[in-house]
């Protein structure tokens, strides 16, 4: 008789999750010489230890501390790019601008990007059927707590001018409830971060509005200013041209506003 299993509202653990994490770790450490010392089996054991046999609605940041320790990585603190609701363009940007880093360009972010995982209380099984949804079930689930933990650490590590890419096509360009709005903004260190520069990415080709005047951007400006960090904002009217100009800055068309 199959024993009763909790049904959650979210999708289950990504298939071949252990193999995927291990393979990603091996690939990352091969590509990044400064991380070659990392033992990927130990990384997987620490990752697994954070959520296996634990109730998937009762995960804490402490559960991830062994993994955080193993994944400790020095990123140039003045080369950090945060993003909200526009991951693909942010990643395209750092693939071209190789000296800048999103969270997913770090080992821990790379391991977990686009994956889902959870376990079950008192069993060593991974739950491939369903995992808790942040809204419908609980916020202290393995995936949400992981991203909250790594995002907090990433923001804490930032210095000088920090850039954030925001999606100008959304109704809330800056969303207080996003990871950026709820975690990263509040963990930038005013002693180290002098300016947060927002890049608002326009969607429509004919959209010439100044989205830096959007009420949600003004809200971000207010939050940042209250934290005694300077704020600046730029419209990226043509994201395609923006990327092209990052690739070829000498191009004559790149002197005009992008």
């Amino acid at each position: 008789v199959p024993r009763w299993r909790q049904q959650w509202s979210g999708p289950g653990t990504t298939k071949r999750f252990p193999e995927t994490v291990l393979a990603r770790c091996v690939k990352y450490t091969e590509i990044h010489p400064e991380m070659r010392h990392v033992d990927c089996q130990s990384v997987w054991d620490a990752f697994k230890g954070a959520f296996i046999s634990k109730h998937p609605c009762n995960i804490t940041e402490e559960d991830y501390q062994p993994l955080m320790k193993l994944g400790t990585q020095t990123v140039p603190c003045n080369k950090i790019l945060l993003w909200s609701r526009i991951k693909d363009l942010a990643h395209q940007f750092t693939q071209v601008q190789r000296d800048m880093f999103t969270l997913e360009d770090t080992l821990l972010g790379y391991l977990a990007d686009d994956l889902t995982w959870c376990g079950e209380f008192n069993t060593s099984k991974i739950n491939y059927q369903s995992c808790p949804d942040w809204r419908k079930d609980c916020s202290n689930n393995p995936v949400s707590v992981f991203w909250k933990t790594v995002s907090r650490r990433f923001a804490e590590a930032a210095c000088d001018v920090v850039h954030v890419m925001l999606n100008g096509s959304r109704s809330k360009i800056f969303d207080k409830n996003s990871t950026f709005g709820s975690v990263e903004v509040h963990n930038l260190q005013p002693e180290k971060v002098q300016t947060l520069e927002a890049w608002v990415i326009h969607g429509g080709r004919e959209d010439s509005r100044d989205l830096c005047q959007d009420p949600t951007i003004k809200e971000l400006e207010s939050i940042i200013s209250k934290r005694n960090i300077q704020f600046s904002c730029k419209n990226i009217y043509r994201p395609d041209k923006f990327l092209q100009c990052v690739k070829n800055p000498e191009d004559s068309s790149c002197t005009s506003e992008i």
Epitope: T74, V75, R153, E191, S225, I229, Q230, S232
Partner: antibody, heavy 114, light 111 residues
């Protein structure tokens, strides 16, 4: 190129007020905070605090709370340091320094003497 | 407040030799591998000049004879080889935590 140009030397009596200016050029003043650093004659450097040039909000180190005031005139790209009720121990060179500490003004010597 | 203890207070080095200046912080000034320590050179009558930022990064325009190293609480400025133009006072500064603090300075002379 980036420059911070400070006002000239000041000779003041105890109890008076002095206001030092620091004019920024080569960049937008409001893009970078401005630090102030004190150096008494023959002594080391002491960080006094900084002003957020975007919001105008000052932050003072404990030893510089009370008689010291940082301010801005954004339209003139200028930051100011005012010292009230001057004391002999305020005799020093005062530097304005752009956030990041790579760009320093030439310094303003304030001498307080009866 | 983080206290920075610089040593030695003064240093005499022969031209072409190596000069090493130490700076010890009363608590760690490093976070996630980035050490928030600056090094400055100051000559009489001039403002300080930034040599090294974040422990080991050479500021633009500064000769490669200057280098910085260290982590957590122990940091070092090395000048190798020393030239006559290097006669000055050198200061470390932590910018990990407000209030930012400076070391007491090391005076470098030529032997």
């Amino acid at each position: 190129q980036i420059q911070l140009v400070q006002s000239g030397p000041e000779l003041k009596k105890p109890g008076e007020t002095v206001k030092i200016s620091c004019k920024a050029s080569g960049y937008t003043l409001t893009s970078y905070g401005m630090n102030w650093v004190k150096q008494a004659p023959g002594k080391g450097l002491k960080w006094m605090g900084w002003i957020n040039t975007y919001t105008g909000e000052p932050t003072y180190a404990d030893d510089f709370k009370g008689r010291f005031a940082f301010s801005l005139e954004t339209s003139a790209s200028t930051a100011f340091l005012q010292i009230n009720n001057l004391k002999n121990e305020d005799t020093a060179t005062y530097f304005c320094v752009r956030r990041g500490f790579a760009y320093w003004g030439q310094g303003t010597l304030v001498t307080v003497s009866a | 407040n983080i206290v920075l203890t610089q040593s030695p207070a003064s240093l005499a080095v022969s031209l072409g030799q190596r000069a090493t200046i130490s700076c010890r912080a009363s608590e760690s000034v490093e976070i996630y591998g980035n050490g928030f320590m600056n090094w400055f050179q100051q000559k009489p009558g001039q403002p300080p000049k930034l040599l090294i930022y974040r422990a080991s990064n050479l500021e633009s325009g500064i000769p490669a004879r200057f280098s910085g190293s260290g982590s957590r609480t122990e940091f070092t400025l090395t000048i190798d080889p020393v030239e006559a133009d290097d006669v000055a006072t050198y200061y470390c500064q932590q910018i990990n935590e407000d209030p930012f603090t400076f070391g007491s300075g090391t005076k470098l002379e030529i032997k």
